[in-house]
């Protein structure tokens, strides 16, 4: 594939990555799949600067990110190491709360209204953010 050197239409470029901000809601798995079909992934937050950028664009709305612990350990969807990486949880989060009565705990992370993170039921239909890195090989064939 060819290297992607600029962002697709309707995506926002920032620090050599492209971001797409949804305006509708999906369950985490559906949001994850949507991003993958766009040759991207749910947003992976690696710095305070990136956190502020995303927060500015989403506003005070619950929004999925690419972080989950559905198989036990917290994992970023692109393989970024959770343990050593940037974290911005709300106080007392993540709490894997079972009291919602929907079954299971809370395995998927989202930005809350103040930008800090919370874990929630993955089936909730929240907005989401896709991210793809510039300079990575695109799946599309090169233009001749």
């Amino acid at each position: 594939g060819s290297e992607r050197t600029c962002c697709p239409v309707n995506w926002v470029e920032h620090e050599r990555s492209c971001y797409w901000f949804s305006r509708s809601g999906k369950a985490w798995a559906d949001a994850d799949n949507y991003c993958r079909l766009e040759d991207a992934h749910l947003v992976v937050v690696t710095s305070w600067e990136e956190q502020k950028f995303v927060q500015h664009h989403i506003g005070p709305v619950n929004t999925w990110m690419g972080l989950h612990d559905q198989n036990g350990p917290w994992k970023w969807v692109d393989g970024t190491d959770y343990e050593t990486g940037f974290k911005n949880w709300r106080p007392e989060q993540p709490d894997d709360w079972y009291g919602h009565g929907l079954g299971g705990g809370e395995d998927c992370a989202h930005f809350t209204d103040d930008g800090r993170w919370n874990d929630d039921v993955c089936q909730r239909p929240y907005r989401w953010v896709c991210e793809t890195e510039l300079d990575k090989a695109s799946q599309e064939p090169p233009l001749l």
Partner: antibody
């Protein structure tokens, strides 16, 4: 590498007390719910208690409610189980577990006169 | 409380066999089910989560299926290291509950 190391087990008389500890390393302890699960000799697994990352959600099995207290110290990466009014039927290997995916090797509690 | 009924309680099989273990919940637990393997003197090890997803590092010979109340664990091409006790566990709601276990023994 994730490690959970239980300690504090031993032989105690009925009605006695023990405090189990679990030392965690290799992961961000304050991001995880922790559980105690026990296994009586030659028997199956029985969940005992659970505590959320910041200790704000705690649950117990009916069989230990009012006698056992779960707690954690995130600054020390440690999980605890205070066991009071012990009974013969509490005799078991007690495992500390991170959520549902990773378990320690257990510490043996024997309650006998 | 949700009861988990596992069957059979034990089974005898030969190397190369394909074995199936079942687990039934007393009420709907969606897919909040884990399968564990336990070898003598060792801690349980998770094999399958959300009823059918393979835990990382676990060989694909292990597979899980089911939703709601009925679940199965299948082990294909049984090898000597697979002879162990297997447990299901629901994590739909507290109290968390386990099946009684299935001991897979060499015929």
């Amino acid at each position: 590498e994730v490690q959970l190391v239980e300690s504090g087990g031993g032989l105690v008389k009925p009605g006695g007390s023990l405090r189990l500890s679990c030392a965690a390393s290799g992961f961000t302890f304050n991001s995880y719910r922790m559980n105690w699960v026990r296994q009586a000799p030659g028997k199956g697994l029985e969940w005992v208690s659970s505590i959320s990352s910041s200790s704000n959600h705690i649950d117990y099995a009916d069989s230990v409610k009012g006698r056992f207290t779960i707690s954690r110290d995130n600054a020390k990466n440690s999980l605890y189980l205070q066991m009071n009014s012990l009974r013969a039927e509490d005799t078991a290997l007690y495992y500390c577990a991170r959520g549902t995916d990773y378990w320690g090797q257990g510490t043996l509690v024997s309650v006998s006169s | 409380d949700i009861q988990m009924t596992q069957s059979p309680s034990s089974l005898f099989a030969s190397v190369g066999d394909r074995v199936t273990i079942t687990c039934r919940a007393s009420q709907d637990i969606s897919n909040y089910l884990i399968w564990f393997q336990q070898k003598p003197g060792k801690a349980p090890k998770s094999l399958i989560y959300t009823a059918s997803s393979l835990q990382s590092g676990v060989p694909s010979k292990f597979s899980g299926s089911g939703f709601g109340t009925d679940f199965t664990l299948t082990i294909s091409n049984l090898q000597p290291e697979d002879f162990a006790t297997y447990y299901c566990q629901q994590y739909h709601s507290f109290p968390l509950t386990f099946g009684g276990g299935t001991r897979v023994e060499i015929r």
